[in-house]
């Protein structure tokens, strides 16, 4: 009896949908695997007789529930199927946005770039897919624990009237208010303000 794949899960970030599993212990030799998806009542092969422990399902529609399954094989024997269901638009992880930061005196000017949908030629982004897309920004004075959060209305934001000659750190994530779903934070970007622009009287 061939044991089934273990720890079967979907690793999906920005609609790059990778089904992953672990090979079970099997004394007779090396196992291969077949992974399939349900397409209108029929299971279709996606990865056949692969020695890998992952399979790319990124071509599946972003919308609706999908049933995926994988089994282990050895010679003419095979394990039972292990099934999972997956809805990309609900389940994919929203990766960190890009962010450009520029210091102008005592202000930080930030521009946000929504993460791209993976493995597509065009520049479609996660913002295209989710109507309610917005950004959360958090910033703090470097070396302190207190963080401030804002929700910009646009793809840019300006933090004004900051302390001069002080390093501030900023990070951004995507947020979907209608789903109460937050994406991953970008890596912090830290920049030092310069002087304030007030002219002494």
């Amino acid at each position: 009896m061939v044991p089934p794949p273990e720890n079967v899960r979907m690793n999906s970030v920005n609609f790059k949908n990778i089904l992953q599993w672990e090979s079970p212990a099997f004394a007779k030799g090396n196992l291969t695997f077949t992974a399939q998806y349900l397409s209108y009542r029929i299971f279709q092969d996606k990865c056949m007789n692969t020695t890998l422990t992952e399979c790319d399902f990124s071509s599946l529609s972003k919308y609706g529930d999908h049933t995926l399954r994988v089994r282990a094989e050895f010679a003419d024997e095979h394990s039972d199927w292990v099934n999972i269901t997956f809805c990309p638009v609900d389940d994919t992880i929203i990766g960190p946005p890009g962010m450009q930061v520029e210091v102008l005196a005592d202000s930080l000017h930030m521009r946000f770039l929504a993460p791209k949908i993976e493995n597509e030629y065009e520049t479609w982004t996660m913002k295209n897919v989710y109507n309610s897309w917005t950004y959360n920004v958090q910033y703090w004075k470097n070396g302190t624990d207190e963080k401030f959060q804002i929700t910009p209305q646009y793809d840019f934001e300006v933090l004004r009237n900051l302390e001069p000659w002080t390093t501030y750190c900023v990070q951004v994530r995507g947020f979907l208010p209608d789903r109460n779903k937050a994406g991953e934070w970008s890596e912090p970007v830290c920049e030092q303000t310069t002087h304030d622009e007030t002219v002494p009287s």
Epitope: Y40, Q44, L60, E120, W124
Partner: nanobody, 126 residues
Framework: QVQLQESGGGSVQAGGSLRLSCAAS????????MGWFRQAPGKEREGVAT???????NYADSVKGRFTISKDNAKNTLYLQMNSLKPEDTAMYYC????????????????????WGQGTQVTVSS
């Protein structure tokens, strides 16, 4: 909400032609992948022709040289020109769309398209 509405089906003699149309609302054809599928009685739904946002096309072997898929982005309409029709082309024809898709993957199965029309019947008699 994306809605697709097919039209242009009907009955025709073998060797004849039909032009199917698919009008979209809530969706822009230039922003995704589109396809025509068909389903004959007692058979599975199968891909007939697909077109990507860049205009590149794919056809099932059984219709190559006879069918042409095209789209008019300005009218937000997808077309399937069917020539030299055969009795085996008899089926319900469905329009399908997958928004924000460009052709990074070849899409050819039902599960790869998220939105569907109600279908239009094509009957070819010998």
């Amino acid at each position: 909400q994306v809605q697709l509405q097919e039209s242009g089906g009907g009955s025709v003699q073998a060797g004849g032609s039909l032009r199917l149309s698919c009008a979209a609302s809530g969706y822009t054809y230039s922003s995704g992948c589109m396809g025509w599928f068909r389903q004959a009685p007692g058979k599975e739904r199968e891909g007939v022709a697909t077109i990507n946002s860049d205009g590149s096309t794919n056809y099932a072997d059984s219709v190559k040289g006879r069918f042409t898929i095209s789209k008019d982005n300005a009218k937000n309409t997808l077309y399937l020109q069917m020539n030299s029709l055969k009795p085996e082309d008899t089926a319900m024809y469905y329009c399908a769309a997958e928004p924000y898709c460009s052709g990074g993957y070849p899409r050819w199965s039902v599960a790869e398209f998220g939105y569907w029309g109600q279908g239009t019947q094509v009957t070819v008699s010998s």
